[in-house]
Amino acid sequence: SSPTSSASSFSSSAPFLASAVSAQPPLPDQCPALCECSEAARTVKCVNRNLTEVPTDLPAYVRNLFLTGNQLAVLPAGAFARRPPLAELAALNLSGSRLDEVRAGAFEHLPSLRQLDLSHNPLADLSPFAFSGSNASVSAPSPLVELILNHIVPPEDERQNRSFEGMVVAALLAGRALQGLRRLELASNHFLYLPRDVLAQLPSLRHLDLSNNSLVSLTYVSFRNLTHLESLHLEDNALKVLHNGTLAELQGLPHIRVFLDNNPWVCDCHMADMVTWLKETEVVQGKDRLTCAYPEKMRNRVLLELNSADLDCDPILPPSLQTS
């Protein structure tokens, strides 16, 4: 078998047939078949190889593991548990690998895992204990710092009879294991709402990406506890207006940058407070790009250029005067 590659390049290994549980012990830093390994970069790439399982014989040195573009379908409990454990594994990318089921304890025995990317997998069945590993009310803290869950919503016909938002949030909150999470990306998931308790229980967040969802309102969402939050991406949602409570909370976050582009802002009398706030605040990035979508007469008007006289509401007619 060929040795692992030097610092400068990746090399495909020869087929490796001895597993950690087979008759002869594996050579400690052998590269699995169908993978490319760089010991110098502490990186293993098993990319676009139609793998149906996680390779059993990953080299102990692996710090960065790419298993993208495969056909894994299911991650069982202990999918990465090895003897000896993969103690150095810090970054794991499983994006685009046709995962639809991630079981409780799938990432157990990875003591250094800081970055996990499950994006572009149709996760119809994400266990509440996928990240916490146990069903205890308070689990051992997860080492995860970055969790990338962009476009994990399954096709509508494959969704279970439960809230997809609820399933994801349950996994984020189980056992309070993700208290140290700093980056959470949940873009492109068709989220209609954000459960009100989720942000309060992720106090270390620096970066939250909720872009390209279907969020209509942030009325019941509290950002107050997210004192470390540096970026909040809300582009490409269905937001109509931000109300006073939300505006005040965002203004109170010391390091925040908010991204609000491409929302269908409704420029009526309810928008007055937000327009006033936009004119004063420095937290909104590209605020000069925000435009009205409704009502028709206000379409494409720049929010920053509006004044109170522009923002009227049609009077609500008493029932006796309404027409059908």
């Epitope: 087929p15 699995p32 399982e53 059993t56 056909q71 379908a73 299911v74 069982p76 069945d125």
Partner: antibody
Framework: EVQLVESGGGVVQPGRSLRLSCAAS????????MHWVRQAPGKGLEWVAY????????YYADTVKGRFTISRDNSKNTLYLQMNSLRAEDTAVYYC?????????????WGQGTTVTVSS | DIVMTQTPLSLSVTPGQPASISCRAS??????????LHWYLQKPGQPPQLLIY???NLESGVPDRFSGSGSGTDFTLKISRVEAEDVGVYYC?????????FGQGTKLEIK
Amino acid sequence: EVQLVESGGGVVQPGRSLRLSCAASGFTFSNFGMHWVRQAPGKGLEWVAYISSGSTSFYYADTVKGRFTISRDNSKNTLYLQMNSLRAEDTAVYYCSRTNSLLRGFFDAWGQGTTVTVSS
Amino acid sequence: DIVMTQTPLSLSVTPGQPASISCRASQSVSSSSYTYLHWYLQKPGQPPQLLIYSASNLESGVPDRFSGSGSGTDFTLKISRVEAEDVGVYYCQHSWEIPLTFGQGTKLEIK
């Protein structure tokens, strides 16, 4: 037509070794995971070992772990089972079987089996 | 390990009559995405053959008098009208985790 043909069975003394082969034809061998399953005389079926299509994953039953090694040569369309330190309880008909994946898969094609007898 | 328990261990059925075999797993072998339970028939002197995969899906070429149902821990294989060629030993098997395990088998005889 999918065909799996096992060979290499025989009578062997305890502690000795044997290598089984399974020749595959009628399908793209390199696209499928493969199993060995055994059946002791008059008994039921027991899963023995699995190897993924590209030899990246290997799994064994506890009863054979450390003694048996599963391997494959996709260029020869052949699956192997190296059996060392054989015991009387390894006596069985050994079947090779095809699957599309380990957990989401099932044994959708079987060979006729080869008989291994471990006896002094 | 997951233990698969089949009942009955043997049954004798008159041709044309229905038959039913039960399989119980010691823990759930279903997720909301997939059911990890499969059925096989081993005819006398032959290797096993796949009948039903994922609890209820009929394998290609298997007569439609065979059907499977169940989820979680309890599963059933039914033969709507037994024929002489159906004799043999029926096995259920899970693929939830390693090790894969089979039921102990149910022997079907013709009266």
